[in-house]
């Protein structure tokens, strides 16, 4: 399963689409900056088996897909870019699911790292809570877009490390 290579390309395409989605000048949104507490430690460890690492990345992509699939998201972002972004994420999720099935036969370790997946879920809960508290304002979405771009960039480093381990 050559997921890290294909996923890295998909990740790059998703980042480009996210970058293109900006609607307002971020300079006007500085006061809305927020610490979402990205679970960096879940992407730092080398203790993961490949299937476990993929399951954490899968959760990250799934939560991002859910976040950008809401009606509030549809009301904020340009529709054609949003559709391309969702399609890209969906493709990545399908690739990952196929890869995990393939890897489970190879590895003896549990399929999922429950604590890491929970940490990712809680991270996205904090993002959703922030958007709710900010009443889904354009600046709140701009801050969230920047945060997701950052988390994608950080997970890309994780994927590259995973590829080097192979």
């Amino acid at each position: 399963c050559d997921l890290p290579q294909t996923h890295s390309l998909g990740n790059r395409r998703a980042l480009i689409l996210l970058a293109q989605m900006g609607r307002i000048s971020p300079f006007s949104c500085l006061k809305d900056r927020h610490d979402f507490g990205f679970p960096q430690e879940e992407f730092d460890g080398n203790q993961f088996q490949k299937a476990q690492a993929i399951s954490v990345l899968h959760e990250m992509i799934q939560q991002t897909f859910n976040l950008f699939s809401t009606k509030d998201s549809s009301a904020t972002w340009e529709q054609s870019l949003l559709e391309k972004f969702s399609t890209e994420l969906n493709q990545q999720l399908n690739d990952m699911e196929a890869c995990v099935i393939q890897e489970v036969g190879v590895e003896e370790t549990p399929l999922m790292n429950v604590d890491s997946i929970l940490a990712v879920k809680k991270y996205f809960q904090r993002i959703t809570l922030y958007l709710t508290e900010k009443k889904y304002s354009p600046c709140a979405w701009e801050v969230v877009r920047a945060e997701i771009m950052r988390s994608f960039s950080l997970s890309k480093i994780f994927q590259e490390r995973l590829r080097r381990k192979e």
Partner: antibody
Framework: EVQLVQSGAEVKKPGESLKISCKGS????????IGWVRQMPGKGLEWMGI????????AYSPSFQGQVTISADKSISTAYLQWSSLKASDTAMYYC??????????????WGQGTLVTVSS | DIQMTQSPSSLSASVGDRVTITCRAS??????LNWYQQKPGKAPKLLIY???SLQSGVPSRFSGSGSGTDFTLTISSLQPEDFATYYC?????????FGQGTKVEIK
């Protein structure tokens, strides 16, 4: 290792043009904004303006609006500060520094070494 | 623009002293405040961001506190290398603005 390397000292005459540079390395250049700060001899720090290299969106302090132009070339990870007509009062040390944009991370955590601009007839 | 006022503008202290510098904003900036140290001929160095978060690699004798309009930078036990000029900077809105600086000199 993150680095911002600025171009060397400049000595210019009033009325001349100038463009100084700030090259970023060791990080994703388009993931951070680049700000410019002036420090006149023996004085404090003055924020001039900022650029988002990902799309070259800029913002200026009212004190510097129309006096300088900030630009960037993301293909070579470099930001610029330029003057079309220098004045003696532009004599100062100019610093570039990176800013995390809307991300929650330390502001202006890395600085260039500074470019000394001297304007004298 | 948001005005930032530091006090004192200079102070004399001895090695081992506890030093406190204050910064006041002309309007609420929540906790969007940074502190920098600058030594002669050198670029500024970030010490504290978001009012109280210690920048990586900065000694723990430096600490920051405050929110709203009033902020404090404290050096718990002044070291020889701490003699420098310190600046606060608001980060809530453009244009970013700095305080006028506080020079910490040897007594």
């Amino acid at each position: 290792e993150v680095q911002l390397v600025q171009s060397g000292a400049e000595v210019k005459k009033p009325g001349e043009s100038l463009k100084i540079s700030c090259k970023g390395s060791g990080y994703s250049f388009t993931s951070y904004w680049i700000g410019w700060v002036r420090q006149m001899p023996g004085k404090g720090l003055e924020w001039m303006g900022i650029i988002d290299p990902s799309d070259s969106d800029t913002a200026y302090s009212p004190s510097f609006q129309g006096q300088v132009t900030i630009s960037a070339d993301k293909s070579i990870s470099t930001a610029y500060l330029q003057w079309s007509s220098l004045k003696a009062s532009d004599t100062a040390m100019y610093y570039c520094a990176r800013h995390p944009g809307l991300n929650w991370a330390p502001d202006f955590d890395y600085w260039g070494q500074g470019t000394l601009v001297t304007v004298s007839s | 623009d948001i005005q930032m006022t530091q006090s004192p503008s200079s102070l004399s202290a001895s090695v081992g002293d506890r030093v406190t510098i204050t910064c006041r904003a002309s309007q609420s900036i929540n906790r969007f405040l940074n502190w920098y140290q600058q030594k002669p001929g050198k670029a500024p160095k970030l010490l504290i961001y978001a009012a109280s978060s210690l920048q990586s690699g900065v000694p723990s004798r430096f600490s920051g506190s405050g929110s709203g309009t009033d902020f404090t930078l404290t050096i718990s036990s002044l070291q020889p290398e701490d003699f420098a000029t310190y600046y606060c900077q608001q980060a809530i809105d453009l244009p970013f603005t700095f305080g006028q600086g506080t020079k910490v000199e040897i007594k």
